[in-house]
């Protein structure tokens, strides 16, 4: 099946110090190799999450990605800040025997925006 | 089908003020991002800002960050820019368009209104 | 901010023969990019979004082609009314949405 990585949302908008979740499906698992999520593009991204073990604040995987044949990356940002507001991106990559990754698809991306917490 | 119809452009010196307005019909105006995109007398085609369906999602180029205000009435079904300070620069047709509802490329634009910034 | 170039800035043809423009991004887009035509007095019409895909009504003479920072439209076979400019559009890194300068495309 060929790989299509889907970003449903364009946007979506929270207000600061609430949770927002960024949903991102893939059509396959071939190739094998990581998905991570980025905040940006080019030079200035700024990796957010990567489901590969590691632990990152405030952002936590929605389903188990670790589940047979899941195909569901979507993660959860908690206690967004003002901070947080740009564009992220779900990317699939193919694991090198021994060279870096290397990125083959990536999603649409979701502009997150921060609302000012209401008073 | 849809129709879009911009108005409110003319002929105004430097620092002056004018109000944009674009009329949509044919669709669910408020289930969809709409932008204002410009063209200068002989360039190319350039994005000036962007707002959520609902309003709450709003975007500007660098350009005229401070200067212009987007802003939409979804009970009207009209989309309006508010340009404050106006430049000589500005000078352009003003195009109202619709994005898809799944990515930011637009499926759907209006004639345009000539904005004439002159002293 | 992703820059995008049209090359050539015009192209000459005649009616029946193959149009090739290009457009090339200053960093990947995968295949989020769209392509545009304008005419004197009339909307702008999108021709093809994904890189590849035709929009609704747009005749098959129009193809798109591409991936990652170059891309490509071809028009096979130039009619009458295809004489106009052609604006790429890219949307996958934004804000901002950032269009190529435009390729004119002229009657020899």
């Known amino acids: 099946k060929e790989l299509k990585v889907t970003q449903p949302e364009k946007s979506v908008s929270v207000a600061a110090g609430d949770s927002t979740v960024l949903n991102c499906t893939l059509t396959s698992l071939l190739p094998v190799g990581p998905i991570k999520w980025y905040r940006g593009v080019g030079q200035s991204r700024l990796l957010i999450y990567s489901f590969t073990g590691e632990h990152f604040p405030r952002v936590t995987n929605v389903s188990d990605a670790t589940k047979r044949n899941n195909m569901d990356f979507s993660i959860r940002i908690s206690n967004v800040t003002p901070e947080d507001a740009g564009t992220y991106y779900c990317v699939k990559f193919q694991k090198g025997p021994s060279e870096p990754d290397t990125e083959i698809q990536s999603g649409g991306g979701t502009e997150v925006y921060v609302l000012a917490k209401p008073s | 089908d849809v129709q879009l119809v911009e108005s409110g452009g003319g002929v105004v010196r430097p620092g002056e003020s004018l109000r944009l307005s674009c009329a949509a019909s044919?669709?669910?105006?408020?289930?969809?991002?709409m932008n204002w995109v410009r063209q200068a007398p002989g360039e190319g085609l350039e994005w000036v800002s962007l707002?959520?369906?609902?309003?709450?999602?709003?975007y500007y180029a660098d350009s005229v960050k401070g200067r212009f205000t987007i802003s939409r009435d979804n009970s009207k079904n009209t989309l309006y820019l508010q340009m404050n300070s106006l430049r000589a620069e500005d000078t352009a047709v003003y195009y109202c368009?619709?994005?898809?509802?799944?990515?930011?490329?637009?499926?759907?634009w209006g004639l345009g209104t000539l904005v004439t910034v002159s002293s | 901010e992703t820059v995008l170039t049209q090359s050539p800035g015009t192209l000459t043809l005649s009616p029946g023969e193959r149009a090739t423009l290009t457009c090339r991004a200053s960093?990947?887009?995968?295949?989020?990019l769209a392509w545009y035509q304008e005419k004197p007095g009339q909307a702008p019409r999108l021709l093809i979004y994904?890189?590849?895909s035709r929009a609704t009504g747009i005749p098959d003479r129009f193809s798109g082609s591409g991936s990652g920072t170059e891309f490509t439209l071809t028009i096979s076979s130039l009619q009458s009314e295809d004489f106009a400019v052609y604006y790429c559009?890219?949307?996958?890194?934004?804000?901002?949405?950032?269009f190529g300068g435009g390729t004119k495309v002229e009657i020899k």
């Open positions: 368009a619709k994005e898809n509802n799944r990515y930011r490329f637009f499926d759907d």
């Open positions: 044919g669709f669910t105006f408020s289930s969809y991002d």
């Open positions: 707002i959520s369906g609902s309003g709450e999602i709003i």
């Open positions: 960093q990947s887009v995968y295949t989020y």
């Open positions: 994904g890189a590849s």
């Open positions: 559009q890219q949307y996958y890194d934004r804000p901002p949405l950032t």
